[in-house]
């Protein structure tokens, strides 16, 4: 058993049918010595008396808010949460496996640049009685500071019969140098509590591996005289690290017909312009990627050919 | 510790080309190592990220773009630094700053070259003959060093009398390649910045 926060405790259980569970001793936070009784949640049934209460915690029915009273007055509370260990592996019931980039990916994180700011998000099908708390650091043995905000509900989607909820959090490394070569990964830890179930999820990454630039901005077409060709031009996104000559991007320009089946023409360039043939009803899209370290491509910025 | 905007140096262009070749070569070699050594801990998540140049060179600081010198986090990230007196920056000649940066890159290359050659000699003794260093990568390191055109005393290749532990050598190869790829990215950024300056 360990303390998650004041008066909230997590009981770690080896979770299998007929498991013996864990013996827990609760102590009433009071100078009083006698006349103390204990109850669980809203029930008035007295579970025991005395300054300490010994319970055998086996299932969720044994978890909840234990309260000690004296003469009708509440003295203190202890909330017991359960953390299930199923065959040596902590349970992951609360969050959905996003399966990207690999199986067992519960937290996904992205950064728009090298400033040390990043966003993480996760998915769940649970809509109520759910709380998250997020901590982060650079490295784990001698951790350096990363400050995270509060997790917020950022999107709701309908997937088949289920509703899916996306939560996200923004974090910022306290003293980040965009040019630094990372040798210790960022660690992100999310505590999730659903009703009386506690789970924790972690992710470990280098900022350089989670970079995903914003799409190029100011995408424009300039027709070339007496030609079906157009000059496409664009600019670095505002959120990208500067100077751009040091933090350079490379670009992919795509001409896509109306039908998805039509052949796509693609051009790769380090410049912020390209000459392409604009077909009728086609659209031109441009996306960006770090020129020197191949992390994710940005989303496409698009303009119609017409 | 910083690189003010400089007048273009005609000698930078070949360096930019060579640094791009270097990044390509080390990335290919790392990919090959990860595929060949699939039963070894060779992914970025599994290895310890060690930097053999730590406390010996100071490339990130010496080659810092002028725009980032205002960022305090960039100025105190290493113990070793070529220029410790921040107030002197304005009075220092751009060419001197550039020389410090490029000589630091040269020293990096030299250290990695020695490590890779020593390692290759061990890998050639492996009866499994599982993996060797790409000669193209070693050649590209050499070419960039020549293009940088610094003279410094040759570091003798480390020779080892004891029987090599091939498992450890292959894991060390992965560690070295990951670190060298990160340094190659920095070198490419620097050359691109100098080229644009």
């Amino acid at each position: 058993i360990w303390e998650l926060k004041k008066d909230v405790y997590v009981v770690e259980l080896d979770w299998y049918p007929d498991a013996p569970g864990e013996m827990v001793v609760l102590t009433c936070d009071t100078p009083e010595e006698d006349g103390i009784t204990w109850t669980l949640d809203q029930s008035s049934e007295v579970l025991g008396s005395g300054k300490t209460l010994t319970i055998q915690v086996k299932e969720f029915g044994d978890a909840g808010q234990y309260t000690c009273h004296k003469g009708g007055e509440v003295l203190s509370h202890s909330l017991l949460l359960l953390h299930k260990k199923e065959d040596g592996i902590w349970s992951t019931d609360i969050l959905k496996d996003q399966k990207e980039p690999k199986n067992k990916t519960f937290l996904r994180c992205e950064a728009k640049n090298y400033s040390g700011r990043f966003t993480c998000w996760w998915l769940t099908t649970i809509s109520t009685d759910l709380t998250f708390s997020v901590k982060s650091s650079r490295g784990s043995s001698d951790p350096q500071g990363v400050t995270c905000g509060a997790a917020t509900l950022s999107a709701e989607r309908v997937r088949g019969d289920n509703k899916e909820y996306e939560y996200s959090v923004e974090c910022q490394e306290d003293s980040a140098c965009p040019a630094a070569e990372e040798s210790l990964p960022i660690e992100v830890m999310v505590d999730a509590v659903h009703k009386l179930k506690y789970e924790n999820y972690t992710s470990s990454f280098f900022i350089r591996d989670i970079i995903k630039p914003d799409p190029p901005k100011n995408l424009q077409l300039k027709p070339l005289k007496n030609s079906r060709q157009v000059e496409v031009s664009w600019e670095y996104p505002d959120t990208w690290s500067t100077p751009h000559s040091y933090f350079s991007l490379t670009f992919c320009v795509q001409v896509q017909g109306k039908s998805k089946r039509e052949k796509k023409d693609r051009v790769f360039t380090d410049k912020t312009s390209a000459t392409v043939i604009c077909r009728k009803n086609a659209s031109i899209s441009v996306r960006a990627q770090d020129r020197y370290y191949s992390s994710s491509w940005s989303e496409w910025a698009s303009v119609p050919c017409s | 510790r910083n690189l003010p905007v400089a007048t273009p140096d005609p000698g930078m262009f070949p360096c930019l080309h060579h640094s791009q070749n270097l990044l390509r070569a080390v990335s290919n070699m790392l990919q090959k190592a990860r595929q060949t050594l699939e039963f070894y801990p060779c992914t970025s998540e599994e290895i310890d990220h060690e930097d053999i140049t730590k406390d010996k060179t100071s490339t990130v600081e010496a080659c810092l773009p002028l725009e980032l010198t205002k960022n305090e986090s960039c100025l105190n990230s290493r113990e070793t630094s070529f220029i410790t007196n921040g107030s002197c920056l304005a009075s220092r000649k751009t060419s001197f700053m550039m020389a410090l940066c490029l000589s630091s890159i040269y020293e990096d290359l030299k250290m990695y070259q020695v490590e890779f050659k020593t390692m290759n000699a061990k890998l050639l003794m492996d009866p499994k003959r599982q993996i060797f260093l790409d000669q193209n990568m070693l050649a590209v390191i050499d070419e960039l060093m020549q293009a940088l055109n610094f003279n410094s005393e040759t570091v003798p290749q480390k020779s080892s009398l004891e029987e090599p532990d091939f498992y450890k050598t292959k894991i060390k190869l992965c560690i070295l390649l990951h670190a060298f790829r990160i340094r190659a990215v920095t070198i490419d950024r620097v050359m691109s910045y100098l080229n644009a300056s």
Partner: antibody, heavy 115, light 112 residues
Framework: QVQLVQSGGGVVQPGRSLRLSCAAS????????MHWVRQAPGKGLEWVAF????????YYADSVKGRFTISRDNSKNTLYLQMKSLRAEDTAVYYC????????WGQGTMVTVSS | SYVLTQPPSVSGTPGQRVTISCSGG????????VKWYQQLPGTAPKLLIY???SRPSGVPDRFSGSKSGTSASLAITGVQAEDEADYYC????????????FGTGTKVTVLG
């Protein structure tokens, strides 16, 4: 004490369907994940499928994906394995088992796929 | 498609020490715990070892398990006639959990 009693096995022709049941007692069935495991005659153990305690997630071996469906009825304390498009290579003793460090197995039920 | 490899058979005389190996990889045994099962002919498997080296109550202490790196082993010290059975190791793969990974199985023969 924990008990898992299986039923539903038998002889079936290739391409046909069969549903296996596993009735649980002696524990809070709705709190635990459950597996199906099979063993072809004279062969080793092969995992078939898993279902979470609340039925929200199901996982299958590649060899049965798209043909077998694992399900549970927590109100009836019963686990099911619906097997469709059966093949000769599905011939085996099928076991249900609880998920956890200490596990309990059903007695097994024989499924024979033969024309 | 077994990823955990065991020797097909091992044998020993009563009283001898018999060991069975179970060889895996970094993503399974290297990252997860190992269980061992005993299966007597015509019966369901019986759990002998869980969590690499823990014995459930009722399992004789002559059975012991250990794990090192990407391999695990089961030792029977002072093998007895009633130990003649098939033995299976089991673990998980970190990418496919909760799918069970079973070993190829080992037939233990008690001679004499």
């Amino acid at each position: 004490q924990v008990q898992l009693v299986q039923s539903g096995g038998g002889v079936v022709q290739p391409g046909r369907s069969l549903r296996l049941s596993c009735a649980a007692s002696g524990f809070t069935f709705s709190s635990y994940g459950m597996h199906w495991v099979r063993q072809a005659p004279g062969k080793g153990l092969e995992w078939v499928a898993f279902i979470r305690y609340d039925g929200s997630n199901k996982y299958y071996a590649d060899s049965v994906k798209g043909r077998f469906t694992i399900s549970r009825d927590n109100s009836k304390n019963t686990l099911y394995l619906q097997m469709k498009s059966l093949r000769a290579e599905d011939t085996a003793v099928y076991y249900c088992k609880t998920h956890g460090s200490h596990d309990n197995w059903g007695q097994g039920t024989m499924v024979t796929v033969s024309s | 498609s077994y990823v955990l490899t065991q020797p097909p058979s091992v044998s020993g005389t009563p009283g001898q020490r018999v060991t069975i190996s179970c060889s895996g990889g970094r993503s399974n045994i290297g990252s997860n715990t190992v269980k061992w099962y005993q299966q007597l002919p015509g019966t369901a498997p019986k759990l002998l070892i869980y969590g690499n080296d823990s014995r459930p109550s009722g399992v004789p202490d002559r059975f012991s398990g250990s794990k090192s790196g990407t391999s695990a082993s089961l030792a029977i010290t002072g093998v007895q006639a009633e130990d003649e059975a098939d033995y299976y190791c089991q673990s998980y793969d970190r990418g496919t959990h909760p799918a069970l990974l079973f070993g190829t199985g080992t037939k233990v023969t008690v001679l004499g």
